[in-house]
């Protein structure tokens, strides 16, 4: 059974994936209309249900083209290191809240990089809220 | 209603100089990528550029860069296309296309160019 | 430069399904978008995000993807589908965008 300092721990992991993830859709949102058309063109595969802290495998496995996508839309821009900074915390959250069990995600859409972003940050909620109440 | 509305045909010599125009209307025009299209007689359909009218930045296909230029006058809401000095493989018709998150979702009626000596 | 390939041609008889493909090596991660073009007539937009279809757009024009292919498909196809299709998408950098070579498609009969 979770021990009430390895929920603590959790739902600590949790607050900062949400951060995280909030940051990198802001600074999306944040660029001016030219670059974020030309980034909604670039595809992310999402799983058929996220529902469960082992679904963060399907998050994980988005990181890399997440990072170059935004890295194309930067370019030589200063931002550049805040998306380093967020993608590297993400990567080691999500390791932490996945466990070692191994899970085959099962994609079934395709969607842009704002809905990407706002489906796992609708997931980070929803187990924040689940896991408070 | 949006619309884009391109200049009437043109006929011209090789050598010359050309602009033709795209005017949008019934939408913010300067949020929008205007693409530029050629389709040469019987022929597809082949991607020249785009640019962006707010702040002018374009993006240009290898295959016309150095070819074209693409310019915007954001103040009355239209988009151009020029050449230096045309040739007789310039001859075809030009669309001008509005481009949004879900693509090319607006087009100009066509502005056909003939050049010929 | 980055290329998108389509068949020249599919002919299929009325009422039957039309399936045109298009293929590009960015297409896992690039959205691809289809265009109808008429004689004399400027393109339109049929299909977009590779599954999406627009207002306006009939129920029987659909769009699939899968790796580095997707398919325009046209089920219970009607004279006034005869037309040129196009694909287009943008290349791994989302910085050129490209249009397939278009096919033709004819309805027989």
């Known amino acids: 059974a979770p021990t009430s300092s390895s929920t603590k721990e959790t739902q600590e992991q949790l607050d900062q994936l949400l951060l995280d993830l909030q940051v990198l859709l802001k600074g999306v949102n944040d660029y001016k209309n030219s670059k974020l058309s030309r980034m909604l063109t670039f595809k992310f595969y999402m799983p058929k249900k996220v529902t469960e802290l082992k679904h963060l495998q399907c998050l994980e496995e988005e990181l890399k083209p997440l990072e170059e996508v935004l890295n194309l839309a930067q370019g030589k821009n200063s931002h550049g290191g805040n998306t380093r900074e967020s993608i590297s915390n993400i990567n080691v959250t999500v390791l932490k809240l996945k466990g070692s069990e191994t899970f085959m995600c099962e994609y079934d859409e395709t969607v842009t990089i704002v809905e990407f972003l706002n489906r796992w940050i609708t997931f980070c909620q929803s187990i924040i809220s689940a896991s408070s109440s | 209603e949006v619309q884009l509305v391109q200049s009437g045909a043109e006929v011209k010599k090789p050598g010359e100089s050309l602009k033709i125009s795209c005017k949008g209307s019934?939408?913010?025009?300067?949020?929008?990528?205007i693409g530029w299209v050629r389709q040469m007689p019987g022929r597809g359909l082949e991607w020249m550029g785009t640019?962006?009218?707010?702040?002018?930045?374009?993006r240009y296909s290898p295959s016309f860069q150095g070819q074209v230029t693409t310019s915007a006058d954001k103040s009355i809401s239209t988009a151009y296309l020029q050449w230096g000095s045309l040739r007789a493989s310039d001859t075809a018709m030009y669309y001008c296309?509005?481009?949004?998150?879900?693509?090319?979702?607006?087009w100009g009626q066509g502005t056909m160019v003939t050049v010929s000596s | 430069s980055y290329e998108l390939t389509q068949p020249p041609s599919v002919s299929v008889s009325p009422g039957q399904t039309a399936r045109i493909t298009c293929s590009g090596d960015a297409l896992p991660r690039q959205f691809a978008y289809w265009y109808q073009q008429k004689p004399g007539q400027a393109p339109v937009l049929v299909i977009y995000k590779d599954t999406e279809r627009p207002s306006g757009i009939p129920e029987r024009f659909s769009g699939s993807s899968s790796g580095t292919t997707v398919t325009l498909t046209i089920s219970g196809v009607q004279a006034e589908d005869e037309a040129d299709y196009y694909c287009q998408s943008a290349d791994s950098s989302g910085t050129y965008h490209v249009f397939g070579g278009g096919t033709q498609l004819t309805v027989l009969g």
């Open positions: 019934g939408y913010n025009f300067d949020t929008y990528w």
């Open positions: 296309a509005r481009f949004s998150s879900s693509a090319y979702d607006i």
């Open positions: 640019i962006y009218p707010a702040d002018s930045d374009t």
